[in-house]
Each structure stands twice: as C-alpha cells, then as structure tokens.
Amino acid sequence: TQNKALPENVKYGIVLDAGSSHTSLYIYKWPAEKENDTGVVHQVEECRVKGPGISKFVQKVNEIGIYLTDCMERAREVIPRSQHQETPVYLGATAGMRLLRMESEELADRVLDVVERSLSNYPFDFQGARIITGQEEGAYGWITINYLLGKFSQKTRWFSIVPYETNNQETFGALDLGGASTQVTFVPQNQTIESPDNALQFRLYGKDYNVYTHSFLCYGKDQALWQKLAKDIQVASNEILRDPCFHPGYKKVVNVSDLYKTPCTKRFEMTLPFQQFEIQGIGNYQQCHQSILELFNTSYCPYSQCAFNGIFLPPLQGDFGAFSAFYFVMKFLNLTSEKVSQEKVTEMMKKFCAQPWEEIKTSYAGVKEKYLSEYCFSGTYILSLLLQGYHFTADSWEHIHFIGKIQGSDAGWTLGYMLNLTNMIPAEQPLSTPLSHSTYV
C-alpha cells in the first residue's frame, strides 16, 4: 500500500503594505506547531496591486474595492480554502496616509473605512486597517530583517544559512526608504538614547534590546523630490527649471498646484507668477547632490549629535540592511554588490546622470518613463541621505548591505508587523509569554 502524505499542519497570514506609491500584499506561511520558533515564518507570495497608493483614491473611495480585488483574489487562490477563515488579514498604511491625515483626518478616515469594508468582504479573518506610526514602521522593519537573518536565535551555528550572517548575535540595523518617509533603526553601542521619542525597549526570545529609531516624514524619495523642486523653483528666474537631477534632454511640465498639493512642500510655498513650469534636465550629479543637501538642516542640533533637522542620531554601530527603495533603486543602477565602494557608487552615479535622456529611454525600454526619469535623482538622494544625513563614511559604507529578500522573504516592515500581531515573537525563550503589542507603541 502507498503511504498517504499527512495533511500539512500550516498556518497563513496576510499583510497589506499600503505605501504612498503602491500597495503590496504579502502572504506568509509557517508550521502551526512551531509558532514560537525563530525563523520559521516565510513569505510564499507577494502581489503588487496595480495602480497607485490608497491615498490617491481620496476623491473616488468607492473604487478602492475594485483596486484591491486582483491581489485579494490571488490570496484566495494561493491559500487553501480550508484555511481561509482562520487566516488573519492586516493592512498597515504608512507615510502616504500619514500625510493625508495631516491634511484631513476626515478624508484619511474615510479611505480607511472603505478599505476595511472592502477587505471584510473576503473569506479571511480581517483584523483591521490602520495607519502605523513611523516608529512602528522602523521597529517592525528591524524585527523583520533580524528575524530572517536568525539574529534572535540562541543556537550558535557553525555554518551560515543566510547571506550577510556573521556567527555573532549582533543585530543588523535597518534602513528603509519609501516614497514618503525613510526610517533608520539600530541598536547603538552602549549609548544613551538622548531623545525618548527615539527609544524602544524590547525583550525578544529572552534578550533585552535598546533600539534607536526615527522616521523622517517627507524624506521618502518621492516627497524629497517634490521638496527639492519646490525649493529650486523659488529661485528660478522664469518658468524654466534647469535641473541637474534629470538627464540632459529630459523635459517635463509640472503644475504648480501639484507641487504644493503635499504638506511636504508647505515650507517652500510661495506665490509664483506662473501656473506651470518646465523641468529641463542638465544631468549633473555634483550639482544635484548640492541641491539635495539643502533639504537637510544641519545647522541646529540640541543633542550630542544629530542626523538632520535637529533629530538625535547616535553614532552608527554594526552592519545595516538597506531595503525597500534603497534596494530597488540601487538594484536598478546595478550598485548593490558588496564589492562596490562608496567612491565607485559616486563615480557610477556621475556617469549615469550625465547620460542623455534619449539614450536612457532606448536602453531601458521596459521601464515606465516616470520611474526611469527619476533614477538619477533617487540614486543621488540615497547617497546624500546615507552620507550627509546619517553620517555613513567611505569606510562605513561597506557595512551597508542592500537587501531585497532574505531567505525568500522581502525585507520590510510587514513580516515584523504580522509576527507581533499574531504573538509569534515571545519575550522569553519558548515556551513563555508572547510579546504584547503595547511594547511597540
């Protein structure tokens, strides 16, 4: 007689990352009997929702359900029907929705309300949609990468199962770049965290962690570009903006109303004698870099040391995983290799930005022109943010690892979020009490 395979005793969870520029749905899977073990949860699917971020649906909230359908359908296909009702679904919205909430709490609530109603229509165990704080976003990103890197495991291994792994249990810092915000999170070396807002205390798997985190709202790559444009148009002599952050020959008309739509440009807002202006690319890395630096106020610091805008930042410590747009942009530019020095990255950026727009379009036919046109800015911004914003140096650059996935799971806040909300990170070594959600807030 043939042996029949026993049914797999597994569980699933779904997290939707409602970012400023798009929404992604992640499906996670783990063995039911090993819930409290470290490193057992893995991603089985990512479905990127076609279209913009949910905050863009503010004028047509009734269509959010249509927008989410394909990926929710995908989740129905991937997860066995018998598991649907017990599969939790969480939606976390990040900086795009934080910005919308700053403009209108009522509109942000309306968007979330429709999201909740839409997701409640599916056969899963919907657990709610909320705007997560920047602090949570940083913390969960840090938990995700360290969980996936096996840093919370107490067992010392003589072999390495994941890339970037050193046998020590020292955690990695987390660098996350989105469209509307950026987060930096790490365990400083014997350093007091001088501002309470930036301090997190965790007890995970029997070990205490004192973690520094900060989320810079408006310093995601898309909002940083809007800031830069709003700053630069102030001093333009007419409706032509010669911009070093775009390729030579690139032209784009921008509506002033679009420029001032976001709260991130309010500090630069002024009455202009025109309703539109034209960006004309000149493709000069050095000038682009200089223009970006003007977005970082480094003249004021009420602490022993700061990142920028008066925000405390302890001395950098250890290795860092740089993910989300840090990774996507650097991957596109072919600059994610561990062997590429900071000087080499700068050199490559100089060459890339100087390439004519027509040449770039021909070389990258399959890339959406809006995204393609912004890689020069984004790459330069990443260098500026890491070097001048966070004070990485040519030497410490080698401690930055640009990470897309670890063990098949995307680096980002979603896995950490789910692990926490499903109580899968115990405070003590298993078996003991799970970490309470309040630890993070």
């Epitope: 479905c47 913009p52 649906f57 359900g65 995908r74």
Partner: antibody, heavy 121, light 111 residues
Framework: QVQLVQSGAELVKPGASVKLSCAAS????????VHWVRQAPGKGLEWVGK????????KFDPKFQGRFTITADTSKNTAYLQLSSLRSEDTAVYYC??????????????WGQGTLVTVSS | DIVLTQSPASLSVSPGDRATISCRAS??????????MNWFQQKPGQAPKLLIY???NQGSGVPARFSGSGSGTDFTLTISSLEPEDFAVYYC?????????FGQGTKLEIK
C-alpha cells in the same frame, strides 16, 4: 503618448502556429495586465486570456488552454500570444489591451490596432 | 461560463435622444460588494474602447452622457443624449470570473 503596436497580419495553414506581438511604449506593461481579445469577421468580441507581466501569471478561457500561450518580455515591454494547432475558426482580428488604474487613480484603457490572423489552406 | 445576453440586438435612435441598452447575466456578477460588469464601444474598423467599468464607473476621457447602472444579473448602459459619433456597437463584459465573457453586442444605428 501610450501606444500598443501589434505585429502585422498573418496568413497561416491549418495546424500551423503563429506568434503575435504587442509592443507598448510610454507605459510599462508590468504596471497592469495585458488582455487578448479576438473578433472573428462580422462577429462579436471574445476574451482569450490575460497575463500579469510582473509575475507571468496567466488566465485563459479554458477553450484556448493548451493551444494558446500568453507570454511577456518586460525588458522589451512586449506581450505575446502564441497560437498553435490553428483551425479555420481561429480566423479573427486579435487585439491586445491594457486596462487598470494609473498613478493618479484614473482608470485607463489602451488597445492595439489588432492583428488579422487568417487560417486557410 | 457566465452567459451575457444583450437587448436589443439593434436599436435605431435619433441624435439627441436617449438610448438604453440592457445586459442580463446567467448568474450574478457581484462579488466582494462589487459588480464586475464593463461596457465597451466599438466603431467599424476600430479597436473597442472601455466606457464603463465595475457597472457604474466611467473610463478615462469618457463623456458624461454615458452612464452605467445595475447589480447582480441586470445591467444597463444609458446614453443620455446621443451625439453623431455615438453610433456604434456596444458590448457588455463580465470580469467576475474566468473566462471573462462578452455579450453578443448591440448595434446602435441612426434613425
């Protein structure tokens, strides 16, 4: 500014195969689904299938499954419909189409000009 | 497969008049609180054009005179005041489940 350009008309023999292409410009096919729809001469529209170029998941009308294949090459920003074991009743204009939400949450649709496939001995 | 039946098969209307086309599905095309019914317009020798998606939402650049309504199995496309360029063939399509199916079409002719 967005254009879908389909390959030229094809005259093929019964039982043969043909591969139609749909090249997009001004838009990345990864950002939406590519649908294929056909229309026999003087008849109505018939949905063939679709592909998500971002992850190559495809869906078909079951009656075409096995005979028709949809693929995409995101580096070329092009989708393909391969027709095999062709029969005279497959004679039709084959359209590729994109529809979905753009960056401003407007619902767009773009269509190719169509490729006439004639199956005849 | 979900079968869509359009009525009438053809319709003669004068410019400026109102035109109504119906589409009936063999089973409900509603799911998750959404009606997965789309409407397309096709002129001779041209590719189709999306007019209405999800029963009642207008496609980009579609004139306001085109509207869609209905849920479950019964849907309607209404053109409030016909313009000369509106004379064409109109198709309904369900996208609730694969295979996405079209109605047989309604030919709108000038009276």
């Amino acid at each position: 500014q967005v254009q879908l350009v389909q390959s030229g008309a094809e005259l093929v023999k019964p039982g043969a195969s043909v591969k139609l292409s749909c090249a997009a410009s001004g838009f990345s096919i990864k950002d939406t689904y590519v649908h294929w729809v056909r229309q026999a001469p003087g008849k109505g529209l018939e949905w063939v299938g679709k592909i998500d170029p971002a992850n190559v998941n495809t869906k078909f009308d079951p009656k075409f499954q096995g005979r028709f294949t949809i693929t995409a090459d995101t580096s070329k920003n092009t989708a393909y419909l391969q027709l095999s074991s062709l029969r005279s009743e497959d004679t039709a204009v084959y359209y590729c189409a994109l529809y979905g939400y753009d960056d401003d949450a407007y619902y767009f649709d773009y269509w190719g000009q169509g490729t006439l496939v004639t199956v005849s001995s | 497969d979900i079968v869509l039946t359009q009525s009438p098969a053809s319709l003669s209307v004068s410019p400026g008049d109102r035109a109504t086309i119906s589409c009936r599905a063999s089973e409900s095309v509603d799911n998750y609180g959404i009606s997965f019914m789309n409407w397309f317009q096709q002129k001779p020798g041209q590719a189709p054009k999306l007019l209405i998606y999800a029963a009642s939402n207008q496609g980009s650049g579609v004139p306001a005179r085109f509207s869609g309504s209905g849920s479950g199995t019964d849907f309607t496309l209404t053109i409030s005041s016909l313009e000369p360029e509106d004379f064409a063939v109109y198709y309904c399509q369900q996208s609730k489940e694969v295979p996405y199916t079209f109605g047989q079409g309604t030919k709108l002719e000038i009276k």
